[in-house]
């Protein structure tokens, strides 16, 4: 049961946190005006990874994207390669999860199939969620690199005369939402491969089975037989430990070979 | 037709108060921010104040800030500038004018005005 | 606060003629977020209210008529009438509308020669 508990919310977590990276990549608030000590503007300039926005003081609201690509600061396009890594793999890390997860049957799809892919899954939610916070974070490291030059020269003019008020820049709602999608996403792939433990099939030492056959009783010692092997009125394949038949939620934990990840 | 019309104003003592009002029609009046503005006699004009459609926002000019306060009544589609501690400089000609949603902040609308006269 | 200076104070004309007024502002009117200009010509004829002619420093407003154009950029800015006719006889207010408080010029008078 805590298995399935975990492996399923780990799925949610992830859901929620690829939602989230995949509304952080589409906002336009990754840099929004600072307003704090600076001259009072009739206009809010804010900029996201693929158009910048101003709006005026009437609520009116103009969007241009940048239509250029070798135009744009490498900075910018890394962050966008970034966050698009993160959506492709977070999305392709759910697909998996989804045929991964315990709870839906998939013909006769084997626990060791269903443990494999949830690592995959809870690897590439990790790779995802790690893309997200590194783009977020190399944007707002060009955002306070970039505030502390503005603020160096933020009044620049010829003789004192002309004056130009460089608009500064501070972080947008985008970079949070960045920031805790990514995280949670982060977190739904360590569930997911912590969940994959649980679900690995034990190869182990089993206690012997009797197995009468015409008439002798001979016991077989197998050593490290699949739990698939039962016979006579086990007929559901149930896993045979300590010669009791348990649910395949009930399995105990043994060290196996997705243990180290 | 857009249309604005200032009342209120008239004659008062120094360190009076004066409350002019600037009704609207033709035009949804809580879609649009609205200014004041005064020209004192042969002078230029001075932007005094603004407030914004849902009057979250409103700001005053330095002249002006601490005396005047600018309010609205959306449902009656109505302005009002409270005036206070009036000066013989504030006497002018108060307009107010409607903001402008798409033409960069500019005024396009402005009404006849009302005179104001601070005299003792 | 931006101070917006406006040259000539008055102009005298003959009707037809080409006229050309200037404003400056002591701070750059261009806005770095989409490259637009946020500054106003208003047109005030004698016991008048003022009438918005131009926006955004070079687009007219409506039912403005074509003999009107703005131009310039950043601080030094341009009203030019390309055939003046008697109607417009007036003064012209230059307004800066990206930082509050937003000023006025104190205006160029058009008067007829």
């Known amino acids: 049961m805590a298995v399935t508990a975990c492996q399923g919310l780990g799925f949610v977590v992830s859901l929620i946190g690829i939602a989230g990276i995949i509304a952080a990549t589409c906002m336009d608030q990754w840099s929004t005006q600072d307003l704090y000590n600076n001259p009072v503007t009739a206009v809010f300039n804010y900029q996201g990874l693929w158009r910048s926005c101003v709006r005026e003081s009437s609520g009116f609201t103009e969007c241009r994207g940048y239509f250029t690509l070798l135009g744009l600061p490498a900075m910018l396009q890394a962050v966008r390669a970034l966050m698009i890594v993160g959506i492709v793999l977070g999305a392709i890390g759910l697909l998996v999860s989804i045929f991964a997860l315990k709870c839906i049957r998939i013909g006769s799809m084997e626990d060791s199939a269903k443990a494999n892919m949830t690592l995959t899954s809870g690897i590439m939610f990790i790779v995802s969620g790690l893309c997200a916070i590194a783009g977020v974070s190399v944007f707002a490291n060009m955002l306070v690199t970039n505030f502390w030059m503005s603020t160096a020269n933020m009044y620049t003019g010829m003789g004192g005369m002309v004056q130009t008020v460089q608009t500064r820049y501070t972080f947008g709602a985008a970079l949070f939402v960045g920031w805790v999608a990514g995280g949670l996403t982060l977190i739904g792939g360590v569930m997911m491969c912590i969940a994959c433990r649980g679900l690995a099939p034990e190869e182990t030492n089993y206690k012997a089975v009797s197995y009468h056959a015409s008439g002798h009783s001979v016991a077989y010692k197998p050593g490290g037989f699949k739990a698939s092997t039962g016979f006579g009125s086990n007929t559901k394949n149930k896993k045979i430990y300590d010669g009791g038949a348990r649910t395949e939620d009930e399995v105990q934990s043994y060290p196996s070979k997705h243990d180290y990840v | 037709e857009v249309q604005l019309m200032e009342s209120g104003g008239g004659l008062v003592k120094p360190g009076g108060s004066l409350k002019l009002s600037c009704a609207a029609s033709?035009?949804?009046?809580?879609?649009?921010?609205i200014h004041w503005v005064r020209q004192a006699p042969e002078m230029g004009l001075e932007w005094i104040a603004y407030?914004?459609?849902?009057?979250?926002?409103?700001y005053y000019a330095d002249t002006v800030k601490g005396r005047f306060t600018m309010s609205r009544d959306n449902a009656k589609n109505t302005l009002f500038l409270q005036m206070t501690s009036l000066r013989s400089e504030d006497t002018a000609m108060y307009y107010c004018a409607r903001g402008g949603y798409d033409t960069r902040n500019a005024m396009d609308y402005w009404g006849q005005g009302t005179s104001v006269t601070v005299s003792s | 606060d931006i101070v917006m200076t406006q040259s000539p104070s008055s102009l005298s004309v003959s009707a037809g003629e080409k006229v050309t007024m200037s404003c400056k502002s002591s701070?750059?009117?261009?806005?770095?977020?989409?490259?637009?200009?946020?500054l106003a010509w208003y047109q005030q004829k004698p016991g008048q209210p003022p009438k918005l002619l131009i926006y955004g420093a070079s687009t007219r407003a409506s039912g403005v008529p074509d003999r009107f154009t703005g131009s310039g950029s950043g601080t030094d800015f341009t009203l030019t009438i390309s055939s003046v006719q008697a109607e417009d006889l007036a003064i012209y207010h230059c307004q800066n509308d990206l930082y509050y408080p937003l000023t006025f010029g104190a205006g160029t008078k058009l008067e007829l020669k």
């Open positions: 701070q750059s009117l261009l806005n770095s977020g989409n490259q637009k200009n946020y």
């Open positions: 033709g035009f949804t009046f809580s879609d649009y921010g």
């Open positions: 407030i914004s459609r849902g009057s979250s926002t409103i």
